[in-house]
């Protein structure tokens, strides 16, 4: 480029910079600075469309810059000036006002509680070894290859034992610091943890002392025994154990100071620790003078097992139990150990399982319970402890007694499956905000039925029906005895149905809802201001 | 091998007051529970008082009979427990047994409290 | 306060014979139970804990069973050094109580 072309080009940006010094008089009334091949000044270009125009255009040729200034200095120009500049402060004034009303008076996002990891997610329990891994497999070793399929439920804790040494009814003769060499080594049990804690899954240690014998606590000596217990808590607690059970502790005489003792000893190591007490029992009454002096003591217990599979009944239990316990942390399942088959027909296992991970508190389940594992399907197995089903050749005894669907292998293959279900619940647990901590209310749906809502602050919000009868039935769902905070809308999203068929995702209308015998639904809907 | 001494007793007017102890050996006193049970041709065998551990406050409990009149204590570093016997009875009077654990594995011989005027 | 009863104060029996001793509890005692056998002049020997749990060095003749309420004490076959009276005692709750106690003598 040339230094001419250069100058030429300047004179163009002062042109465009300051059209104050552009003439306003010229005859278009739209003179235009070009940068031409020549610096010979302006080009005028006159353009007069017709002779009218023109003439118009010759009455007014605009104001020169000292009468533009002269009129803008005038008094009514400068009002105006003022007025516009306090109109616009103002209107930007009362846009923030208004901005900070809006915040303050927007309802607060309500605070969240303190969450420890037991209150996340569902425990699992393992209280047989050997019959959870099937033969010849039962040690700590084979159970640190099992991690990844517990990872796959999505269980927050694994409840393992006990494993200690005891020889039956033998208090001398019973170690908690010791584990049995049949189940591995101390070593064992510590790569067990690192591995566990490497895939979040925390490991709870059963030491109810004398698991093989007759008494759980033996029934003497009852000093000699706690002492142990107290030994062991301090010593596993300090190996990396992120909590213990104790089971049959309405047989431990003065459990409520026993376990306000070993709380205080797990507490204290630890707020992060859990201390899970089992009972038989299933009278309000013993549960909740177990629970009174145990602030965040975890119960199982034969509470629910007690329902009679009525919709009603199993409301009554839960709303009695809940508003028993007060604010307290609940955890929910049928029995301190055993399988739900031993309480449930088959049909009503997907109903439990939607109900235990729904309702307010922490779902406890046996291994197998994910399956519908049942004893009574396999002769010559024990009640409390069947062979679990990883595939059809974990059950040889009886060629064909297994099949296919009846397996851990044959259930994840099949998303309508029992297993399938159990893993979508269990995911839906850990992660919604109104099913990790979600206010509960419980109204009135017909006869036979149980519902709920599951609601916290402005999250989506949970809707649980459950048919426990083995008709069909409408559900009247009458919203008059929820509190305002956990209004009905008139249609809601269905998230899972226990039973197939139903289109999940499609909006259904609350009003027109029906329930196949022994289905639970589990639906969504937004919060409404 | 494990041993309870008792000793203390004697004669002793109603309404006065005497202390028992009993010394053990060959076990970890500081963690066993300790009690004392008495026994008169009257009543027979009639469970005290017991005393429980450091890690249990020490707690103590009572028959009906002798609440608000004795007191259990126990001092670990001497493996020693104790009964104080105040405002005593005619019905008071038998031997008195300190024993370890719950139920009591071990007895000592006894040492006999006679009430009486 | 949970009372103790021995049904029989007194046993006559025949060495050899096998002995059966009761025990009722006016509630549950959860197997909280102890059997003691005392000879004259001797302070009480605890024979079973737990209801069943025998004591080391007490021989296998005698056995405890039993659960809830009622509860028995047997001896198979009957030795003269058996010859003493035997007390069942519950430690489920306090006050602790004994049953008044069962003299038993060879006929």
């Known amino acids: 480029m040339s230094q001419d072309t250069e100058v030429d080009m300047k004179e163009v940006e002062l042109n465009e910079l300051e059209p104050e010094k552009q003439p306003m008089n010229a005859a278009s009334g739209a003179a235009m600075s070009l940068a031409g091949a020549e610096k010979n000044g302006l080009v005028k270009i006159k353009v007069a469309e017709d002779e009218a125009e023109a003439a118009a255009a010759a009455k007014f040729t605009g104001l020169s810059k000292e009468e533009l200034l002269k009129v803008a200095g005038s008094p009514g120009w400068v009002r105006t000036r003022w007025a516009l500049l306090l109109l616009f402060w103002l209107g930007w004034l009362g846009m923030l006002a208004g901005a900070v009303v809006i915040i303050v008076r927007a309802p607060r996002c309500r605070e969240l509680p303190a969450q420890k990891w037991w209150h996340t997610g569902a425990l699992y329990r393992i209280g047989d070894l050997q019959a959870f891994q099937g033969h010849g497999a039962g040690n700590l070793a084979g159970l640190k290859g099992r991690l990844d399929y517990l990872s796959s439920l999505k269980v927050k804790g694994l409840v393992l034992g006990p494993i200690h040494k005891n020889q039956k009814d033998d208090v001398a003769q019973t170690d908690l610091l010791q584990i049995d060499p049949n189940f591995g080594s101390k070593e064992d049990f510590d790569s067990l943890l690192q591995s566990a804690k490497k895939k979040s899954i925390r490991v709870i240690l059963d030491l109810t002392p004398n698991y093989r014998g007759e008494n759980s606590w033996f029934s003497t000596q009852v000093d000699t025994v706690a002492t142990k217990v107290k030994d062991a808590l301090e010593f596993w607690l300090q190996a990396g154990v992120d909590g213990f059970q104790v089971r049959d502790i309405e047989n431990l005489k003065d459990a409520s100071s026993f376990l306000a003792e070993w709380q205080n000893i797990t507490k204290g190591f630890s707020e992060d620790r859990l201390l899970i007490a089992g009972t038989n029992s299933s009278d309000l009454q013993q549960i909740l003078s177990l629970l009174e002096s145990n602030k965040d003591l975890l119960l199982t217990s034969s509470y629910l097992s007690d329902s009679g599979s009525t919709g009603e009944h199993t409301k009554s239990l839960v709303t009695q139990y809940l508003n028993a316990t007060g604010n307290r942390w609940c955890s929910w399942s049928l029995s301190q150990a055993r399988l739900l088959t031993s309480f449930l027909p088959a049909q009503l296992l997907r109903l439990y399982q939607l109900m235990l991970f729904t309702l307010p508190g922490t779902p406890v389940f046996s291994y197998g319970d994910e399956i519908g594992l049942d004893a009574a399907a396999l002769p010559g197995q024990p009640m409390e402890a069947p062979v679990m089903l990883w595939d059809e050749s974990s059950f040889p005894d009886i060629p064909g007694a297994v099949s296919a669907n009846m397996t851990v292998k044959g259930q994840s293959e099949d998303p309508g499956s029992l297993l399938s279900l159990f893993r979508r619940l269990s995911d839906q647990r850990s992660k919604e905000r109104s099913l990790l901590h979600g206010d509960f209310h419980a109204f009135s749906a017909g006869p036979g039925l149980f519902s709920y809502i599951r609601h916290w602050d402005q999250n989506e919000r949970f809707l649980v029906v459950l048919n426990f009868g083995d008709v069909g039935l409408s559900a009247g769902l009458q919203a008059s005895d929820l509190p305002a905070s956990a209004s009905l809308p008139a249609k809601a999203d269905l998230l899972l149905s226990t039973q197939p068929g139903r289109e999940e995702g499609s909006p259904l209308e609350l009003e027109r809802l029906k329930l196949e015998p022994h289905e639970g639904l589990l639906l969504r809907f937004p919060y409404a201001a | 091998e494990v041993k309870l001494e008792e000793s203390g007793g004697g004669l002793v007017q109603p309404g006065g007051s005497m202390i028992l102890s009993c010394v053990a050996s060959?076990?970890?006193?500081?963690?066993?529970?300790m009690n004392w049970v008495r026994q008169s041709p009257e009543k027979g065998l009639e469970w005290v008082a017991e005393?429980?551990?450091?890690?249990?406050?020490?707690?103590?409990h009572y028959a009906e009979s002798v609440k608000g009149r004795f007191t259990i204590s126990r001092d670990d570093s001497k493996s020693t427990v104790y009964l104080q016997m105040n405002n005593l009875r005619a019905e008071d009077t038998g031997i008195y047994y300190c024993?370890?654990?719950?139920?009591?594995?071990?007895w000592g011989q006894g040492t006999l409290v006679t009430v009486s005027a | 306060d949970i009372q103790m009863t021995q049904s029989s104060s007194y046993l006559s029996v025949s060495l050899g014979n096998r002995v059966t001793i009761t025990c009722k509890a006016s509630?549950?005692?959860?197997?909280?139970l102890a059997w003691f056998q005392q000879k004259p002049g001797n302070a009480p020997r605890l024979l079973i804990s737990?209801?069943?749990i025998l004591e080391t060095g007490v021989p296998s003749r005698f056995s405890g069973s039993g659960s809830g309420k009622d509860y028995t004490l047997s001896i198979t076959s009957l030795q003269t050094e058996d010859v003493a009276t035997y007390y069942c005692?519950?430690?489920?709750?306090?006050?602790?109580?004994f049953g008044g106690g069962t003299k038993l003598e060879i006929k």
């Open positions: 024993s370890r654990g719950d139920p009591g594995a071990y």
């Open positions: 060959g076990f970890t006193f500081s963690n066993s529970w």
């Open positions: 005393i429980r551990l450091r890690s249990n406050n020490y707690a103590t």
């Open positions: 509630d549950h005692i959860k197997n909280w």
């Open positions: 737990g209801a069943t």
């Open positions: 005692q519950q430690y489920w709750s306090t006050p602790y109580t």
